[in-house]
């Protein structure tokens, strides 16, 4: 659990509270709500920030249309249960024992039930579909421009691999980055393509998860990119089991108004 | 050297409220956390929260939150515990201690809730 | 909440021999576990900190040892007053607990 040991903060992360009384009295940060210690070379990840807002004092088109089992979370906010590592819990109940299965971004993936609901397993989130819609701009984007800005910006600020930014289209006033990451591809330290979509989508809200770094400053050749609306599609490696179609499958996951 | 000083003995009846000051000294005191255990008689430790003076951050024991309150007061060095809508059950030795492994204790307070 | 469970509830031996104390938690909490030994009208005193780092001006004679769910305190020696109470505390995450306690006892 390293963090800055000069003055025993956590960059990463700035939901936490440290202090020097981790292993060999190295500086650790707990992360608020579950007091879980948080590496803070690396993100954090996405249950335990959740958990930590919530108990903080708070046609020849180049887009990709999500398939019918693409998730949009319109749930909204909830206190989560995280397991000894930080990530979801497969099953999440609420303090009236109503209770429902969530993938590994913790997104509801079946109907609500109650205490009996089983949920077998942690289903990956492999696919994840960050749709974005920036203001008018004089003119396009280049695309080859701002694809490499936005690779560079999740391999620099988020510690994203490369590898698992599977792709960036444009078409005004569209972006659409795609991130993919199977179970079989993470290696032991490998960033979750869930928790840079997240950090990600806090930074596009203003609301910077790292410690003390400025808000997001989007640029492609000096032009600022300016985000207008976020949409979030999350693909499981097993599909989603709700009883009936879902008519709030196209729902925003996020309305964005800077 | 690291010393944990806690006020002296309490008698309280059911109903009231009681409050336990813990002094530091020998360390920074706004740089580690500070936990309070408490023990009944005969039995084992019991942890009822903790709070981080730097910025009083607190967390609590569920079974604690709605009766429990703690406090830091920085200029001081000293951490407050405050337990209200006193039982007979709350009857017990309660001690501060620093840091995650609790490396200092207090020298305890005992307090009694009889009618 | 984690759960810790101590064995043996009593554990009853003689100065000189060595004492193994046993503490299983209920969900993997790494290193995060820490030793305590309690004498009568006394307060808890740290013995051993993250499953197995010593703590200054405590007797080498006590150790541990263990990482995920089950970790042990190790006595190598037993002195007469190593004989008192002893308790495991976890700090992997709120709320943290303690054991239930082991008394080591003169045979």
């Known amino acids: 659990h390293t963090a800055a040991q000069d003055n025993c903060t956590c960059p990463t992360n700035k939901m936490t509270v440290c202090s020097p009384d981790g292993p060999g009295g190295r500086c650790q940060c707990r992360a608020l709500g579950s007091g879980m210690a948080v590496d803070c070379s690396t993100l954090t990840s996405k249950c335990l920030l959740l958990k930590a807002r919530m108990s903080a004092p708070k046609n020849a088109r180049t887009l990709v249309r999500p398939s019918e089992h693409a998730l949009v979370d319109n749930d909204g906010l909830y206190d989560p249960d995280c397991d000894p590592e930080g990530r979801f819990k497969a099953r999440q109940c609420n303090q009236t024992s109503v209770c429902w299965c969530v993938n590994s971004v913790g997104v509801r993936r079946t109907d609500k039930g109650d205490l009996s609901l089983r949920c077998d397993e942690l289903v990956r989130t492999h696919h994840i579909l960050i749709d974005l819609r920036h203001r008018p701009t004089a003119g396009a984007f280049n695309h080859s421009d701002l694809d490499a800005e936005l690779r560079r910006l999740f391999r620099e600020r988020y510690r994203l691999h490369p590898k698992f930014v599977a792709a960036v289209h444009y078409e005004q006033p569209t972006i659409q980055i795609e991130l993919r990451q199977n179970t079989s591809q993470k290696a032991a330290g490998d960033v979750d393509i869930g928790d840079a979509a997240y950090y990600f989508e806090r930074d596009i809200k203003g609301e910077s998860l790292f410690q003390g770094r400025g808000g997001l400053d989007l640029r492609v050749r000096g032009e600022p990119l300016q985000v207008e609306r976020t949409l979030i599609y999350y693909l499981d490696e097993i599909p989603p089991k709700f009883s009936m179609k879902r008519l709030t499958h196209h729902h925003h996951h996020h309305h964005h108004h800077h | 050297q690291v010393q944990l000083v806690q006020s002296g003995a309490e008698v309280k009846k059911p109903g009231a409220s009681v409050k336990v000051s813990c002094k530091a000294s020998g360390y920074s005191f706004t740089t580690h956390w500070i936990h309070w255990v408490r023990q009944a008689p005969g039995q084992g430790l019991e942890w009822i929260g903790t709070i981080f003076p730097s910025n009083a951050y607190a967390v609590y024991n569920q079974k604690f939150r709605d009766r429990v309150t703690m406090t830091a007061d920085r200029s001081i060095s000293t951490a407050y515990i405050e337990l209200s809508r006193l039982r007979s059950d709350d009857t017990a030795v309660y001690y501060c201690a620093r840091a995650s492994y609790f490396d200092y204790w207090g020298q305890g307070t005992t307090v009694t809730v009889s009618s | 909440e984690i759960v810790l469970t101590q064995s043996p509830a009593t554990l009853s031996l003689s100065p000189g021999e060595r004492a193994t104390l046993s503490c299983r938690a209920s969900?993997?909490?790494?290193?995060?576990i820490h030793w305590f030994q309690q004498k009568p009208g006394g307060a808890p005193r740290l013995l051993i900190k993250?499953?197995?780092e010593s703590i200054s001006g405590i007797p080498s004679r006590f150790s541990g040892s263990g990482s995920g769910t089950d970790f042990t305190l190790t006595i190598s020696s037993l002195e007469p007053e190593d004989f008192a109470v002893y308790y495991c505390q976890h700090s992997h995450s709120w709320p943290f607990t303690f054991g239930q306690g082991t008394k080591l006892e003169i045979k």
């Open positions: 993250y499953a197995s």
């Open positions: 969900q993997n909490i790494g290193t995060s």
